[in-house]
């Protein structure tokens, strides 16, 4: 039996075995197709989203399709249901938590009153002056917080209790890549993850623990992301996997918060990775045990530099390690979640690629996560 | 303080192009609709096009449809107008104002004044 | 596209004076409607927004109100500083359209 799953597929109507390597290859070899449903999907980038947060104490922004124009939240008659429909507006179903916030001296948007038409946040009709003089600050759910916070060296072992949101993605029972819980059904990780096997049925999520094989798995329903494109590979480096049962959360699985979509960081900015991965280039073995670094962002002209990537990182990637080598992200670490700290822990970054590990002009590439809030949210959307 | 400057106008011959730029500061580009309004001397506003915050949609009056071309680059802060096979009735004072949430033009540039003649 | 006429085209009127201006929208436009005021060689300056909303700096002897496709502007008391050209817009569809114009003379 176990051989058979491991190297062979059972197809419906009539009953028979394929190869398990025919799986998601694009061909139809069962009868009814079921060879190439469950496999990696890709999902469009899609239209803007026509709500979003702000770095600015998470207050409620909201585009008028009307104008083309973003404004912010007024809090006079903000209900508890129009916080529920800007939260399902984003792909969110959990119950969200909001507050007045008042509205500070650089206050740079109009600031107008909101109703709701057909499950969507709009602007009041007759709307006059904000009367409350407050803003509306919204949180969709509970992330980002952790029991322990870190202490700022080198590399050092990891406790589950400083990352509760990091989880081990496995293939066969190996792990291959890092991830993020978001929410207690989707977890963040890489595209290039699934380069290689494309169908879900093997794939596993482990949550929980800082030992590489010391916890449950939990069964993926979907993994989705931005269409390949084999022109530009390191593109669009972005994925989401769907949990077939929700995560219960608790003091060691708990979710890391998505970044603000301005949440611009500037060069030197401290930030955290984490991950299984190799401790050495081209070599070595997985760590067992988790390991953490503190790093800082690298400006993206540096970046780029002659001696450095020379172009190839785009606005949609953004680059982190130290200006001296030695720290940084290596194979295995991919998919995991490059951290900022401000109340919360956020997933600024995606590992996704660079070359070698730890070299002083070639720092850590990661895909930029404030670039794909907008498909995250119809991804969720769609998934509803 | 939002502030608009308009730059690029001139004397061109009937059939020619121009572009026309708007630099802004003092206020988050990125999320403003831009708008582009002209007034030919002794004569009324008209206005001409609309850019969303992000680009991805662009509404033009029917009198420049096909001719002008809304365009911004919000990594530069700027709002261009790219006006081909200009005719005397496009003489006027083109004006760059910020969009406002359906609440008028709060903020406008100085100005740049566009001459079609021969 | 939305046709706003305004009237009167031109009037005349002495400082303390009060002043109505009105905007009528070919079609229903809420209450998206802004008034502008103008001087020659200068951009122009919002007034009211929301058809009667005052923007602020603008002095309280200025008031807007209306909705739906009739709308007015009245200025209460007429300052010399006044004197200028108004004009209604609507932003409630694109295209975004302004109506002709009033001139505000010194009789």
């Known amino acids: 039996k176990v051989i058979l799953d491991k190297y062979y597929f059972l197809c419906g109507q009539p009953l028979h075995f394929i190869p398990r390597k025919q799986l998601c290859d694009g061909e139809l070899d069962c009868p009814l197709g079921e060879d190439e449903e469950h496999c990696v999907k890709s999902f469009p980038e899609g239209p803007a989203v026509a709500v979003r947060l702000s770095k600015d104490r998470s207050t409620l922004q909201v585009l008028d399709s009307a104008t083309g124009n973003w404004f912010s939240a007024c809090f006079d008659n903000f209900t508890e249901a129009l916080a529920e429909t800007a939260c399902r507006q984003m792909g969110y179903s959990s119950k969200p938590t909001f507050r007045a916030v008042e509205i500070g001296p650089d206050q740079d948007l109009d600031v107008v009153e909101i109703t709701e038409n057909s499950q969507e946040l709009r602007m009041r009709n007759s709307s006059g002056p904000c009367l409350s003089g407050s803003l509306v600050s919204l949180h969709c759910l509970a992330c980002g917080k952790s029991l322990k916070t870190p202490r700022v060296v080198g590399v050092e072992e990891a406790s589950v209790d400083s990352w509760p949101w990091q989880v081990s993605i496995q293939y066969d029972k190996q792990h291959v890549c890092g991830g993020s819980i978001l929410d207690p059904h989707w977890v963040l990780t890489a595209a290039h993850c699934f380069r290689k096997h494309t169908d879900v049925f093997n794939w596993k999520v482990r949550a929980g623990s800082d030992k590489l094989g010391s916890f449950p798995s939990l069964a993926v329903a979907k993994i989705i992301i931005i269409e390949f494109n084999p022109m530009y590979p390191k593109d669009n480096d972005i994925a989401l996997m769907k949990l077939q049962f929700p995560l219960t959360f608790s003091g060691t699985v708990r979710p890391i918060c998505l970044p603000f979509f301005d949440e611009e960081l500037t060069p030197a900015t401290p930030l955290w990775i984490i991950g299984w991965g190799f401790t050495k280039q081209n070599g070595g073995k997985m760590s067992d045990i988790l390991l953490q670094a503190s790093v800082q962002v690298i400006d993206s002209t540096r970046c780029n530099a002659d001696d450095a990537y020379q172009g190839e990182v785009t606005e949609k990637m953004m680059c982190a390690g130290i200006p001296e080598g030695g720290v940084d992200t290596c194979q295995g670490d991919s998919g995991g979640p490059l951290m900022y700290q401000s109340d919360q822990w956020h997933v600024v970054g995606i590992v996704s690629w660079g070359y070698g590990c730890g070299g002083p002009s070639t720092p850590g590439v990661y895909t930029k996560v404030s670039a794909y809030l907008n498909w995250i949210y119809n991804v969720w959307k769609a998934e509803l | 303080e939002v502030q608009l400057l308009e730059s690029g106008g001139g004397l061109v011959q009937p059939g020619g192009s121009l572009r026309l730029s708007c630099a802004a500061s003092g206020f988050t580009f990125s999320s403003y609709a831009m708008h582009w309004v002209r007034q030919a001397p002794g004569k009324g506003l008209e206005w001409v096009a609309v850019?969303?915050?992000?680009?991805?949609?662009?509404y033009y009056a029917d009198s420049v449809k096909g001719r002008f071309t809304i365009s911004r680059d919000n990594s530069k802060n700027t709002l261009y107008l790219q006006m081909n096979s200009l005719r005397a009735e496009d003489t006027a004072v083109y004006y760059c104002?910020?969009?406002?949430?359906?609440?008028?033009?709060?903020?406008w540039g100085q100005g740049t004044l566009v001459t079609v003649s021969s | 596209d939305i046709q706003m006429t305004q009237s009167p085209s031109s009037l005349s009127a002495s400082v303390g004076d009060r002043v109505t201006i009105t905007c009528r929208a070919s079609?229903?436009?809420?209450?998206?409607l802004a008034w502008y005021q103008q001087k020659p060689g200068k951009a122009p300056k919002l007034l009211i927004y929301?058809?009667?909303s005052l923007q602020s700096g603008v002095p309280s002897r200025f008031s807007g109100s209306g909705s739906g496709t009739d709308f007015t502007l009245t200025i209460r008391s007429l300052q010399p500083e006044d004197f200028a050209t108004y004009y209604c817009q609507q932003s409630y569809s694109t295209p975004i359209t302004f109506g002709q114009g009033t001139r505000l003379e010194i009789k």
């Open positions: 850019i969303w915050y992000d680009g991805s949609s662009k």
């Open positions: 079609q229903n436009v809420g209450s998206w």
């Open positions: 104002a910020r969009g406002e949430v359906r609440r008028g033009f709060q903020h």
């Open positions: 929301a058809a009667s």
